[in-house]
Interface confidence: low
Amino acid sequence: AGHLEQPQISSTKTLSKTARLECVVSGITISATSVYWYRERPGEVIQFLVSISYDGTVRKESGIPSGKFEVDRIPETSTSTLTIHNVEKQDIATYYCALWEAQQELGKKIKVFGPGTKLIITDKQLDADVSPKPTIFLPSIAETKLQKAGTYLCLLEKFFPDVIKIHWQEKKSNTILGSQEGNTMKTNDTYMKFSWLTVPEKSLDKEHRCIVRHENNKNGVDQEIIFPPIKTDVITMDPKDNCSKDANDTLLLQLTNTSA
Amino acid sequence: AIELVPEHQTVPVSIGVPATLRCSMKGEAIGNYYINWYRKTQGNTMTFIYREKDIYGPGFKDNFQGDIDIAKNLAVLKILAPSERDEGSYYCACDTLGMGGEYTDKLIFGKGTRVTVEPRSQPHTKPSVFVMKNGTNVACLVKEFYPKDIRINLVSSKKITEFDPAIVISPSGKYNAVKLGKYEDSNSVTCSVQHDNKTVHSTDFEVKTDSTDHVKPKETENTKQPSKSCHKPKAIVHTEKVNMMSLTV
């Protein structure tokens, strides 16, 4: 089955610059299929823009200004690229790539879409680092004792733009866990968001990861925030002497990392 | 030019109660086109649900039914037993892929219908309230309550900032909520919740500490293994102290 990945969750540009949006095709040979690009402007219907067929033929929707959009494909990387020249306010939209995927039965086809890339146009000069800054919250003892479950909370602050995706996984598992999240909130010129995961008692002794996708993540890779295992009988940790206290005392350990 | 027009901009549905979305075609006979339905969820993911006839996306067959009303020139999508996962914007779209003559392989979309999911009417349930802390940050976790109306107060004399609560449907079909704030005296912050004309206070097993107990280990480059920031000898922390281990990465 064909699968489409748009690695850029968002693409922030200043006016008149060029935006290049990528779409990676897997499960199907890109040179044996057509790739379509659609855009969804705020408050408008999703509209077909341009396609590139298996033989390289480009088809543009009528009414689309010539020279505005360029579509290409690179078989070696199984990637289709939509280039938007001279970006302006009316180009603000979410751009989706898509392809027709044949079903097993005769004549049955469906069009599958990539997750979309949001094109953002800004005139702001932003701080050097506008990647999401994480803070983690571990389960309350009251919750683990009373409800035989624990909630992890992942707070992300001081990021720009507002487009962000958060999901949770157990360590050594690719299964995405069912989590909940708040709305993205504006704080001055940046944004914040939080997500939380409630796990049953039997999963508290596993390491959990809050995985964050954002345009400005360091090196362009997903940020992984590790939530250490919680032992429900006794918790053993491995800190340096100056981190430990007598076992009967309260230990409030706060780890800070400015390089996230 | 043809146009696909959803019957409603927003459709509130209750968990477990069947709901029907309709989308009419203007300017053409709907029978000349294939109708498709898609759902866009938070994060813009566009997921295929249904295409004429009887083609369903993975996981949609048991809970969705697509149909065409030729006489009324409209497409119908029925959600048989809505759950909180079904919240999102639903789009009808048409194409003529594989039809005779001048067929088109592009999709023509209608505007979306926003489906909001509410728990079905049920007995009132009071929340459980828990506090989670890290540095100046405090989160008040409010679990499994019904109905939705709630006031969450983080009680402190030294507020820096507070955020609007997030209220979501819980997997069991009630509500969960989280309210976040930043406080100079986070150790003394408690949470109280007004629900159904009653007040519920956070359940507190934690022993209070003052800020001199904060241990700040040296910074580490490795966000993936924060527990290794303090190098090696052992400390044993009993369960009662679990919440006091907070990490800012």
Epitope: E105 | G31, E52, K53, D54, G98
Partner: antibody, heavy 118, light 110 residues
Framework: EVQLVESGGGLVQPGGSLRLSCAAS????????MNWVRQAPGKGLEWISY????????YYSDSVKGRFTVSRDNAKNSLYLQMNSLRDEDTAVYYC???????????WGRGTTVTVSS | QSALTQPASVSGSPGQSITISCTGT?????????VSWYQQHPGKAPKLMIY???NRPSGVSYRFSGSKSGNTASLTISGLQAEDEADYYC??????????FGGGTKLTVL
């Protein structure tokens, strides 16, 4: 092997009832709309009924509406046609047919013969 | 719903081309692109030859083609062969959510 096999035909008196079955094999039955088509001796094909995958949508031709009932059991990979109040003009070979996408039939059974006669 | 109109019979010599017409109304053939053609040999079940006006299922010879103009659909068989001798039926979806067949055309290869 991908196939449809009809059964249940036979001789029946006018006003009587009969239940036809169609067993599907070799493909995912639950993902296809199914139809019944009949052919009177020496005559042409006549479509009589359609049922969608989930049984949500059902259509009948005017000639059988109110007398015939189509149903399916996806767990058993089976299609059924309950025929009541049978008439002489219902005498025909009855075919079940799989719908390819939108009103075309890409797989047919070999048919079962129904004779209505006193 | 009355049947679509087809000629009762057509004939042609091997190697020739023949066309079978199928005439309906704006409520069926003219209104929708859901016209199919079936071939039926005596004592056998029908076989799909053309779907959605002009599409050929895999396994059907390229000699069979379909088209439509207004309320009339056509099946053309080029390079006629002996094994093409059979009955041919057209069908169309109708505005009353039913399917209607043509009366059938007997093709004789001379």
């Amino acid at each position: 092997e991908v196939q449809l096999v009809e059964s249940g035909g036979g001789l029946v008196q006018p006003g009587g009832s009969l239940r036809l079955s169609c067993a599907a094999s070799g493909f995912t039955f639950s993902t296809y709309g199914m139809n019944w088509v009949r052919q009177a001796p020496g005559k042409g094909l006549e479509w009589i009924s359609y049922i969608s995958t989930s049984s949500y949508t059902i259509y009948y031709s005017d000639s059988v509406k109110g007398r015939f009932t189509v149903s399916r059991d996806n767990a058993k990979n089976s299609l059924y046609l309950q025929m009541n109040s049978l008439r002489d003009e219902d005498t025909a070979v009855y075919y079940c047919a799989r719908e390819g996408d939108w009103w075309y039939f890409d797989l047919w059974g070999r048919g079962t013969t129904v004779t209505v006669s006193s | 719903q009355s049947a679509l109109t087809q000629p009762a019979s057509v004939s042609g010599s091997p190697g020739q081309s023949i066309t079978i017409s199928c005439t309906g109304t704006s409520s069926d053939v003219g209104g929708y692109n859901y016209v199919s053609w079936y071939q039926q040999h005596p004592g056998k079940a029908p076989k799909l030859m053309i779907y959605e006006v002009s599409n050929r299922p895999s396994g059907v010879s390229y000699r069979f083609s379909g088209s439509k103009s207004g309320n009339t659909a056509s099946l053309t068989i080029s390079g006629l062969q002996a094994e093409d001798e059979a009955d041919y039926y057209c069908s169309s979806y109708t505005s009353s959510s039913t399917l209607v067949f043509g009366g059938g055309t007997k093709l004789t290869v001379l």
